[in-house]
Interface confidence: medium
């Protein structure tokens, strides 16, 4: 009789699991929302308004390219590739906006562009490509533009605060402004290896008259024209056997 | 009351599923056995005895290499790689033994080696590597061996029945026999493109005295020394989105 | 191919894949830049023994060791990832792959 | 890492992964050349709401559409393949990968 009683208790336990309430569509969606946050390692949904997105979202080729991969009105955006069979999202591209840096501010009393903050999770040897994108304002007449990217360093004895990263010369014609990308992979890898060496950069893009065409702090009507870093990484999650 | 009755019927259906008998370990193993056969696209377990395996299993480097990838006494042989997330097994290497062919038998009344039968599932453009492995019997004295692989063709006007695939010259010293591999990728791809052209091959390995050292039909004590084809394929299952 | 596909009008009682669209705009997740919606799908239905059974590793449970397992379950047997472009709340836009977000196939296990 | 690991002596009642070795030699499958045995593992145990829940795509089922779904199930949430060397009964030895043969992790879905 005792074993029969035990069996009934077991059956009841199973049936409790079975008759567990069939949730509504909204509960199902809620569960998927929780799951997405968990997979992206986010505790809560980022608190960002549509206006903030409009200001921040770069109006630049790499973003256009990524967004154009989606037919966002189409219901099925799954790429049908193999199941990675792990839980968390893998990162392929990181687009980083400039943030403020005390060091940069101190240079001559007003904030300068640009300081990029990096997550310690990015490993230097996983960086496949790193490009600094800058927007050059439109010109009135055909002109040659001298673009210079300088890296801020600790002041040297002779007072030097900058060292050159890249210089390039390009011809601009009247019309719309242009996005220009500059390879900064080596610099980024050095920053990741020695984070203390990342004190910021200065961007200059001077035309023949010495006017700076680089948008570093967007003015009115210049939303989405901030400089930004596009970093492509190989993110192969470690698969340890138990 | 009607909806309550419906709910009870539903509950009972769920509970029937729930109280479904917990199977024993042997049932679990049986299910896995069925699953393996299904994944390998086999209707039943191949009926092959230990003796037959000992006779058939080539005693050759590529087999040792494959077997040595396993720690067969260790309980966990999973390679921990990404889940392919599809059902059927993917093939990486096919080792094909020779079979008999009417055409080969007719050449001069006695069976000749070798005819290799291929599955129509192997696509010629998926072949990465194809090697014919032949075993050369030991020699008494140092000698030069002339290895010739001939392809059987439909008799031509001049009576020609063979065309050369590969010839090689190698030096052999007394000791044990050796396994020699010959690249036959192009021939195999042609056979796969035009199966009717696959009439078989002849293997000759003559020493300086004209003795044939190639084991084509193993004699006593020569189990596992048959010629065989080692074919490496890329098997990327098509993944259609629904 | 294994697994049944159904829709909300189906009379199928067995384990089946049903459509379910997740619309990020609808619940105000503007921080997801793309896609704005995607088809997640879900599994539902009854499981008879070995019907559409893909993994026998679950329900064939040692008799002496019941531990409340409720027999075969209608569950995803094939899933695929989606690519997503999103703000991570740290002045960064991330493009990455999220595994197991779309149910491609359902089965009993 | 997600998912619990147990053995036959565990008192754990929740969804857990248990060891199970499949020994091909033991049941006379000599046609499998290697491995001679492998650890398949299996899932068993009770599922409370969202405990170890990996895929919400199963048990969160439309209220108006029950279709006999039995709530969350203890089922494999991560599986891996094994490589196998075997005779296929056609004078051929095949070396290939068989997907989803090892249960690496169990969860409720």
């Amino acid at each position: 009789e005792n074993s029969e009683q035990k069996e009934n208790v077991e059956k009841e336990g199973l049936c409790n699991a079975c008759t567990w309430r069939q949730n509504t569509k909204s509960s199902r969606i809620e569960a998927i929302k929780i799951q997405i946050l968990s997979k992206l390692r986010l505790e809560t949904a980022p608190n960002i308004s549509k206006d903030a997105i409009r200001q921040l979202l770069p109006k630049a080729p790499p973003l256009r390219e990524l967004i154009d991969q989606y037919d966002v009105q189409r219901d099925d955006s799954s790429d049908g590739s193999l199941e990675d069979d792990d839980y968390h999202a893998t990162t392929e591209t990181i687009i980083t906006m400039p943030t403020e840096s005390d060091f940069l501010m101190q240079v001559d009393g007003k904030p300068k562009c640009c300081f990029f903050k990096f997550s310690s999770k990015i490993q230097y040897n996983k960086v496949v490509k790193a490009q600094l994108w800058i927007y050059l304002r439109p010109v009135e007449t055909p002109t040659t533009v001298f673009v210079q990217i300088l890296r801020l360093i600790k002041p040297m004895k002779d007072g030097t605060r900058y060292t050159g990263i890249r210089s390039l010369k390009l011809d601009m014609n009247p019309g719309t402004g242009i996005w220009q990308s500059i390879d900064v992979k080596t610099v980024l890898q050095n920053w990741l290896k020695q984070p203390e060496s990342n004190l910021g950069i200065e961007i200059k893009a001077l035309d023949e008259n010495g006017h700076d065409l680089a948008v570093t702090f967007p003015g009115p009507g210049e939303d989405g024209l901030n400089p930004f870093l596009e970093v492509k990484v190989t993110d192969t999650p470690k698969r340890s056997r138990r | 009351e009607n909806s309550e009755q419906k709910e009870n019927v539903e509950k009972e259906g769920l509970c029937n599923a729930c109280t479904w008998r917990q199977n024993t370990k042997s049932s679990r193993i049986e299910a896995i056995k069925i699953q393996i056969l299904s994944k390998l696209r086999l209707e039943t377990a191949p009926n092959i005895s230990k003796d037959a395996i000992r006779q058939l299993l080539p005693k050759a480097p590529p087999l040792r290499e494959l077997i040595d990838q396993y720690d067969v006494q260790r309980d966990d042989s999973s390679d921990g790689s990404l889940e392919d997330d599809d059902y059927h097994a993917t093939t990486e290497t096919i080792i094909t033994m020779p079979t008999e062919s009417d055409f080969l038998m007719q050449v001069d009344g006695k069976p000749k080696c070798c005819f290799f039968k291929f599955s129509s599932k192997i696509q010629y453009n998926k072949v990465v590597k194809a090697q014919l492995w032949i075993y050369l019997r030991p020699v008494e004295t140092p000698t030069t061996v002339f290895v010739q692989i001939l392809r059987l063709i439909k008799p031509m006007k001049d009576g020609t029945r063979y065309t050369g695939i590969r010839s090689l010259k190698l030096d052999m010293n007394p000791g044990t026999g050796i396994w020699q591999s010959i690249d036959v990728k192009t021939v195999l791809q042609n056979w796969l493109k035009q199966p009717e052209s696959n009439l078989g091959i002849e293997i000759k390995a003559l020493d300086e005295n004209g003795h044939d050292l190639a084991v084509t039909f193993p004699g006593p004590g020569e189990d596992g020394l048959n010629p065989f084809l080692e074919v490496k394929v890329t098997d990327t299952p098509k993944r259609s989105r629904r | 191919d294994f697994g049944l596909d159904c829709d909300e009008h189906s009379t199928e009682s067995r384990c089946c894949r049903y459509p379910l669209t997740v619309d990020f705009e609808a619940f105000g997740w503007d921080w997801i830049i793309a896609p704005k919606r995607y088809k997640a799908n879900y599994c539902s239905g009854e499981c008879e023994f070995v019907f559409l059974q893909k993994y026998p590793h679950t329900h064939l449970v040692h008799q002496a060791n019941p531990r409340g397992s409720a027999g075969p379950c209608c569950t995803p047997t094939k899933m695929s990832p989606i690519n997503m472009l999103y703000f991570n709340g740290k002045e960064q836009i991330i493009y990455g792959k999220i595994p197991a977000m779309v149910v491609d196939r359902c089965g009993c296990s | 890492d997600f998912g619990l690991d147990c053995d036959e002596h565990s008192t754990e009642s929740r969804c857990c992964r248990y060891p199970l070795t499949v020994d091909f030699e033991a049941f006379g499958w000599d046609w499998i050349i290697a491995p001679k045995r492998y650890k398949a593992n299996y899932c068993s145990g009770e599922c409370e709401f969202v405990f170890l829940q990996k895929y919400p795509h199963t048990h969160l089922v439309h209220q108006a559409n029950p279709r006999g779904s039995a709530g969350p199930c203890c089922t494999p949430t991560k599986m891996s393949p094994i490589n196998m060397l075997y005779f296929n009964g056609k004078e051929q030895i095949i070396y290939g990968k068989i997907p989803a043969m090892v249960v690496d992790r169990c969860g409720c879905s």
């Epitope: - | 005693k59 040792r64 290499e65 040595d68 020699q180 | - | -």
Partner: antibody
Framework: QVTLKESGPVLVKPTETLTLTCTVS????????ISWVRQAPGKGLEWVGI???????YYASWAKKRLTISKDTSKNQVVLTMTNMDPVDTATYYC?????????????WGQGTLVTVSS | DIVMTQSPATLSLSPGERATLSCTSS????????LSWFQQKPGQPPKLLIY???TLAYGVPSRFSGSGSGTDFTLTISSLQPEDAATYYC??????????FGQGTKVEIK
Amino acid sequence: QVTLKESGPVLVKPTETLTLTCTVSGIDLSHTDISWVRQAPGKGLEWVGIISYAGKTYYASWAKKRLTISKDTSKNQVVLTMTNMDPVDTATYYCARGVPAYSHGGDLWGQGTLVTVSS
Amino acid sequence: DIVMTQSPATLSLSPGERATLSCTSSQSVYHANWLSWFQQKPGQPPKLLIYWASTLAYGVPSRFSGSGSGTDFTLTISSLQPEDAATYYCAGGYGGGRYAFGQGTKVEIK
């Protein structure tokens, strides 16, 4: 004539790295496995590792963290590198054709080279 | 780890006598027959005698024979000759790239 010949330092200091070369003649390394076996003075044979015809390596469990075997087919050479040498690694190191215990592996051996580990 | 045990450690017999050397493996060798026997004389490298547990290597006198399967193997020298004085080793293969030697049996001729 088919031959194998081991060469390398006779004396190695503790913690140093040992590099031994097995030079073969009359053997095609792209078709032949080469094994390394060692024998401490007055002791038995001990399997060290293999490099297979296809270039895959298999090492004895005790050697996995310290051992690398590589080959240069064009030079007819197989190289054994063992790091962090210890006096207990004092032995005669042999290279052999094939794999002892598999088929007729081990039908041909080098003469061996005695390596002494001492400060 | 795999252990291969050879017995006896030393065998002392007269010429013409039958020598029986035993080799036991803690695990079954691969395919039941991945086992070889080697002969080694002082100052020389080993010499292959038997492979696949029972196949006589090229040039080895027929008085040597091998038998056994799985975990238990025997090397028999039907009629000992003075030149057979040596140490004999068994070597097993286990798949997974694992190989092991026995500790050896020393055969002395009285």
